[in-house]
């Protein structure tokens, strides 16, 4: 019996009955065995078929078989109810080999011409399976010439059988206090040949509780305990399971903070698996009772390990642990069922004793010594000589623990000295002057330091003077001996002040005229204001109206008198303001250089002379009465004049203070 072609020869060709296309003889038997390469199959079809027809093709036939399976037994020319002829059918081997057998019996009633067939090897598409048959691959099947291969979706790995996809389902660790885990693909069927390990690992002190939820379906066996697929639960104390079947296992209270769940599947079955919802519990901490005037947040039925609460105090109360203040308080429940810190108190805010007010006093309004939340105090300044600046002096103890004014200020009010008070109710280089009485010129300052000069007290720690009077001491402020509160130049009874810094106007040039002849001395301490020591006021914007030509100003000092000596007693002189053009003209003739009198100067004195300021009065104030406020203000600073004090046709020249208000204010606010 011819074998036919065998691989690796080319697998295609023609088969025909003996004698074809002539009639075939009786008692013939012919067998062909065709073999294709692995992964290929054989395709066969007939181009001519003419065999004797007999019941179930018992006489003459062509039989096609592949392995042990008969694919077809063929006879006749056309198919009948019980016999089959090939017609246009194509036949395929089941594997890579095909057997063809031709047989004729002992007789033919008439001549039959037999058959002609063609065959060829073709690739098998292993990925195509008949309905109802198991798929070739678990997930993805890839056909190629001569074979196929399988691959898996993400999260799976190809089993060593090269067809099954095993789940990559180990090493998952759950650390949250509750959660869910399930078999792979749940609720769809779980994968075959898989071994899954899940870990729940909570902090020490927690105990894991497992609840099986929704559905449970793991392949089982009626007699043997879970021989195929199973679920096991392991703790450090005990093992639960194995579990399989269709009944939801009961809740498992593991009494452990670590749990390992193992799920193993075999190669067969179609089951949906399982789902576990896990929670945890721990030893509860004592229920937190809020301190008086406080509340707990969040409010829970119970507090267990890692749970926390915070305490919030009502407005006007503050968190204190003993004497120590806290901005916030949070306690955490520990594994032994205790809180990690004790409960604080919500204590009423206490602003404490209010600070002393320099030159003022404080009065408790709410009650003697009451300094707690919403308590009220009243600051006031020492009458007559001080006035309160900015606010009304009423302060409330607020929730932040600070005494706060009605304007929201937390700083103390300021008792500012009242300026421009004088014992004189009306208005001499004091030359031709009169003796001053106590309280007449309480702003008068005596400056000693090389020469005798004067100044005027501003506020309670500044002295206004002439630049030329303190120029030599500008770098050695401490050399200035500053005295106030006395009438007698040589008296041992005076208030001593010392200079902290000297500020000379940047526009002043020493020994080159007297323009910008103005300076400020900052005292190193505030002086106490009284009837003998009171600051002079600075001019208001409207002050020019009290300093017109012929308006009377008063100059005071210990300068030279008519007798040619420094005055022992403070002297003063009332002198009128001189027209500026008239004064300029008076100083345009020699020996004075042109432009000696500038717009930053004002002149005062009598045309007839006799009343003037003189050497030793330099830096002192030329003051005017503001009739609206009834306060004295400084209009001029004794600066320069004729060599002969009180000379007719010559006038005393003063620095015009109103021109320097911004300069004065800037220096005082900056320093």
């Amino acid at each position: 019996t011819p074998l036919g072609p065998k691989w690796p020869e080319p697998v295609f060709g023609r088969l025909a009955s003996p004698g074809f296309p002539g009639e075939y003889a009786n008692d013939q038997e012919r067998r062909w065995t065709l073999t294709a390469p692995p992964g290929y199959r054989l395709r066969l079809y007939f181009t001519h078929f003419d065999l004797e027809l007999s019941h179930l093709c018992e006489y003459d036939f062509v039989k096609l078989s592949s392995g042990a399976k008969v694919l077809a037994t063929l006879c006749g020319q056309e198919s009948t109810d019980t016999e089959r002829a090939p017609g246009k059918d194509t036949f395929y081997s089941l594997g890579s080999s095909l057997d063809i057998t031709f047989r004729s019996d002992y007789s033919n009633e008439k001549p039959f011409t037999g058959f002609e067939a063609f065959y060829a090897a073709e690739d098998i598409d292993e990925c195509q399976v008949a309905p109802g048959e198991a798929p070739t691959c678990d997930h993805h099947c890839h056909n190629h010439l001569g074979g196929f291969y399988c691959s898996c979706r993400a999260g799976y790995v190809l089993h060593r059988n090269k067809r099954t996809c095993s789940a990559l389902c180990s090493g998952q660790v759950f650390t949250q206090r509750s959660g869910e885990l399930s078999s792979p693909e749940y609720p769809r069927p779980y994968p075959k040949l898989s071994s899954c390990t899940y870990s729940i690992s909570l902090e020490e002190g927690f105990s894991v509780i497992l609840d099986f939820v929704e559905s449970f379906d793991v392949e089982t066996h009626p007699e043997t305990l879970c021989p195929y697929d199973f679920l096991k639960i392991q703790t450090d104390r005990e093992e639960h399971g194995p579990f399989c079947g269709k009944t939801l296992p009961h809740r498992i209270e593991t009494k452990s903070n670590t749990v390992t769940i193992t799920f193993v599947t075999d190669e067969s079955g179609d089951h949906t698996g399982w789902k576990i919802h896990y929670t945890s519990t721990a030893q509860p901490c004592p229920y937190p009772m809020a301190p008086p005037n406080g509340h707990v947040s969040p409010v829970q039925a119970k507090y267990i390990l890692k749970d926390s609460f915070s305490i919030f105090c009502e407005t006007g109360y503050e968190l204190l642990q003993g004497h120590l203040p806290l901005k916030s308080f949070t306690a955490v429940c520990q594994k032994d069922g205790s809180w990690d810190r004790p409960m604080p108190a919500c204590s009423i805010v206490d602003c404490g004793p209010p600070d002393d007010l320099p030159s003022g006093r404080v009065e408790y309004i709410t009650g003697p010594g009451v300094t707690t939340y919403k308590a009220v105090i009243q600051y006031s300044c020492e009458e007559t000589f001080y006035t309160m600046k900015v606010n009304d002096g009423k302060y409330v103890c607020e929730a932040d623990g600070f005494w706060t004014s009605s304007k929201g200020e937390k700083s103390l009010p300021v008792c500012e000295p009242v300026c421009g008070l004088s014992a004189r109710t009306t208005g001499g280089r004091i030359y031709g002057g009169q003796k001053a009485k106590p309280g007449d010129f309480p702003w008068q300052v005596l400056i000693l330091g090389g020469t005798t000069a004067a100044g005027a007290l501003l506020y309670d720690n500044w002295v206004l003077t002439a630049a030329h009077a303190v120029y030599e001491q500008k770098h050695d402020a401490s050399a200035l001996d500053i005295r106030m509160g006395t009438l007698k130049r040589l008296s041992p009874h005076y208030t001593q002040a010392w200079s902290e810094a000297v500020f000379i106007h940047e526009g002043y040039t020493h020994d080159a005229g007297f323009d910008n002849d103005i300076a400020l001395i900052k005292l190193n301490n505030k002086v106490v204001i009284n009837s003998n020591i009171t600051p002079i006021c600075l001019p208001r914007k409207e002050a020019e109206s009290f300093m017109r030509t012929d308006d009377i100003g008063t100059a005071s000092g210990w300068g030279l008198t008519q007798r040619g000596f420094l005055a022992r007693n403070l002297m003063y002189v009332d002198i009128p303001i001189v027209d500026h053009q008239k004064c300029t003209a008076a100083y345009e003739k020699p020996p004075y250089p042109r432009g000696s009198v500038t717009a930053n100067m004002l002149c005062a004195g009598l045309e007839s002379g006799g009343k003037d300021s003189c050497r030793g009065d330099s830096g002192g104030a030329l003051v005017f009465l503001d009739s609206e406020t009834e306060r004295w203000f400084v209009g001029g600073i004794v600066s320069w004049g004729s060599m002969n004090c009180g000379e007719a046709g010559q006038y005393g020249v003063y620095t015009k203070v109103i021109n320097y208000i911004p300069w004065i204010e800037n220096i005082i606010s900056d320093f």
Epitope: Q321, G322, H323, L324, P325, K327, R341, P342
Partner: antibody
Framework: DVQLQESGPGLVKPSQSLSLTCTVT?????????WNWIRQFPGNTLEWMGY???????SYNPSLIGRISITRDTTKNQFFLQLNSVSTEDTATYYC???????????WGQGTSVTVSS | NIVMTQSQQFMSTSVGDRVSVTCKAS??????VAWYQQKPGQSPKALIY???YRYSGVPDRFTGSGSGTDFTLTISNVQSEDLAEYFC????????FGSGTKLELK
């Protein structure tokens, strides 16, 4: 980590003022807690001097009221001690410390030695 | 001011021993007491707060107890590194330290 560092002169003359600075790193002094000055005299006795709280409020040892002032500069995360009219009895090692009564760790500076002597 | 009295200035002990350092307040301070350990040349280190709460990182051989006026710091199984001076601090009303107890080897 919270760190505190004291700085200031090691020698002060009697009747003068003692001024020390505590520089805090790793935590804002306005966030919470009390920021204290504590001193340790020769012989190891510890004395709490006072604190400035996160809000800027101060509390002083009653025995030092009138001489002590604690202030702060929140922009530099520093707080300061000023002790006026010092005498030889104020010779000590001065520590700045964050004290919280258990609400967070206590942290101390390494201390700075101050001698009052003419 | 509340006075905190540590009656024993020195205490002798051996490695492995159990020792108790006591502190008495002149008036009720609730549980607002802390304990500190100080070694020569170092700043104090906090051990216990609120009378009985141990700071994290402090070995559990250190325990604190007491409330009101009487407080105790107990060191069980004394180690050589525990030889130091121990101070109590009350922070109930202002802050005051005890005078200190020095733990030394027998």
């Amino acid at each position: 980590d919270v760190q505190l560092q004291e700085s200031g002169p090691g020698l002060v003359k009697p009747s003068q003022s003692l001024s020390l600075t505590c520089t805090v790193t790793g935590y804002s002094i306005t966030s919470d807690y009390a920021w204290n000055w504590i001193r340790q005299f020769p012989g190891n006795t510890l004395e709490w001097m006072g604190y400035i709280s996160y809000s800027g409020r101060t509390s002083y040892n009653p025995s030092l009221i009138g001489r002590i002032s604690i202030t702060r500069d929140t922009t530099k995360n520093q707080f300061f001690l000023q002790l006026n009219s010092v005498s030889t009895e104020d010779t000590a090692t001065y520590y700045c410390a964050k004290l919280a009564g258990g609400h967070g760790m206590d942290y101390w500076g390494q201390g700075t030695s101050v001698t009052v002597s003419s | 001011n509340i006075v905190m009295t540590q009656s024993q200035q020195f205490m002798s002990t051996s490695v492995g021993d159990r020792v108790s350092v006591t502190c008495k307040a002149s008036q009720n301070v609730d549980t607002n007491v802390a304990w500190y350990q100080q070694k020569p040349g170092q700043s104090p280190k906090a051990l216990i707060y609120s009378a009985s709460y141990r700071y994290s990182g402090v070995p559990d051989r250190f325990t604190g107890s007491g409330s009101g006026t009487d407080f105790t710091l107990t060191i069980s199984n004394v180690q050589s590194e525990d030889l130091a001076e121990y101070f109590c601090l009350q922070y109930n009303s202002y802050l005051t330290f005890g005078s200190g107890t020095k733990l030394e080897l027998k």
